[in-house]
């Protein structure tokens, strides 16, 4: 029974997007009154795991020594205090990469773009997939865009961006996936360096913020119109 206790905070280290075989630690932080922590995984019997709190009792560690498909999914945690169980944490989406072969990422018409113009990043897979994702390295939200064709199997996805500004310059990678599990991604594509040159007009000095300003993706070339799950996944359903 969820009580009036404040919800805990749930996060993953080193992050929520983990390569196959790598280790990951899930942390749940509650209050100093916590006596026990529980981790639930969506579509798995509850509780998925229980842990005693680490001193000073305000958090617990759930360890995954080697990432596999079984661990990918959506998690929530709770803590128990003398007055009962807390509300659930916001969800954590743990994503595994390396489930499929890597796609190819290219830029049309060219990876060299003039500010104020457009570019389309094209992610192509060898086998048909129904979901493609584009990420920008060192962006505030590492997974910027998720695209689904409502089950239609495609060999490629186009990510249009316009107007491009200096903020869009940087390194991009893409992933592909199947709709039945958005938590299992391909190996990442080789990196694509997008270079924004010149300007149609002198822009003001760029701020330090990343492209993840949405997409779609919203965008902000990739600005999503959907929600931003706790993992930092930004989903944009086309």
């Amino acid at each position: 029974q969820a009580g009036p206790l404040p919800k805990p905070t749930l996060w993953a280290e080193p992050g929520s997007v983990i390569s196959w075989g790598n280790s990951v630690t899930i942390w749940c932080q509650g209050t100093l009154e916590a006596r026990e922590y529980r981790l639930d995984k969506e579509e798995s019997p509850a509780p998925w795991d229980r842990q005693n709190p680490l001193e000073p009792k305000n958090k617990a560690r759930f360890s995954i020594p080697s990432m596999t498909e079984d661990y990918a999914g959506r998690y929530r945690c709770y803590y128990r205090s003398p007055v009962g169980w807390s509300q659930p944490s916001d969800p954590l989406e743990l994503v595994m990469t390396g489930a499929y072969s890597k796609p190819t990422l290219s830029a049309l018409p060219s990876p060299l773009v003039t500010s104020g113009k457009s570019v389309t990043l094209l992610c192509q897979s060898r086998s048909p997939m129904d979901t493609f994702l584009l990420i920008k390295e060192r962006a505030a939200h590492p997974l910027l865009h998720l695209r689904s064709e409502h089950g239609a199997q495609q060999h490629q996805a186009e990510f249009p961006m316009s107007p491009v500004t200096s903020v869009h310059g940087g390194t991009y990678r893409c992933f592909s996936s199947h709709g039945f599990s958005h938590y299992l991604l391909s190996h990442p594509s080789d990196p694509l360096e997008l270079i924004v040159s010149g300007s149609l007009e002198d822009p003001r000095p760029s701020p330090t913020r990343s492209v993840s300003t949405a997409a779609g993706p919203e965008d902000q070339p990739l600005m999503p119109t959907g929600s931003v799950p706790h993992s930092g996944l930004r989903r944009h359903w086309e």
């Epitope: 113009k117 902000q220 990739l222």
Partner: antibody
Framework: EVQLVESGGGLVKPGGSLKLSCAAS????????MHWVRQAPEKGLEWVAY????????YYADTVKGRFTISRDNAKNTLFLQMTSLRSEDTAMYYC???????????WGQGTSVTVSS | DVQMTQTTSSLSASLGDRVTISCRAS??????LNWYQQKPDGTVTLLIY???RLHSGVPSRFSGSGSGTDYSLTISNLDQEDIATYFC?????????FGGGTKLEIK
Amino acid sequence: EVQLVESGGGLVKPGGSLKLSCAASGFTFSDYGMHWVRQAPEKGLEWVAYIFSGSSTIYYADTVKGRFTISRDNAKNTLFLQMTSLRSEDTAMYYCARADGRGAMDYWGQGTSVTVSS
Amino acid sequence: DVQMTQTTSSLSASLGDRVTISCRASQDISKFLNWYQQKPDGTVTLLIYYTSRLHSGVPSRFSGSGSGTDYSLTISNLDQEDIATYFCQQGNTLPWTFGGGTKLEIK
């Protein structure tokens, strides 16, 4: 629900100034680039200005460059268009619109009317 | 600047008809072509972006196609509420430019 509400339009003499505002709600304003678009009476749509989400980049149509200034206050979820040295050809309905980052304007306000006449 | 041309300024059709509105760009715009609907009260709505992608909430009777310089908007089963003016717009390079509009009327 995304909502954009323009205000500040009115009647102004040639050479005069006017400041339009656009109040945004229903989305994280600071995440999106914004546009001003205008439509003269019985005419088509004309793009006026664009401001990137963090105000880092701004573009203007040649017809307004040097006279109009687009700005935004992300803390107040508001977009502005400062118009100076107004001419009769600036008479139009002015719309603010949200940039979708893919070359389109995905949500528009209802517009505010500006009339420049002596 | 990229010039956008909608050769048909007005179009008359019957309810239930399949209607196609064309738009031509003065240069290749790499599919960065969008369609908007403006109702008689002035309300503007995005229908299609990036040539063929349907904006959320737009009925599936609207579709878009094209490439290079030639693009079109198709309304497959004309409804009374589709009476409006339709504008194309290129988002390939600033300044963004619009076509002159096509006013759709009922026969």
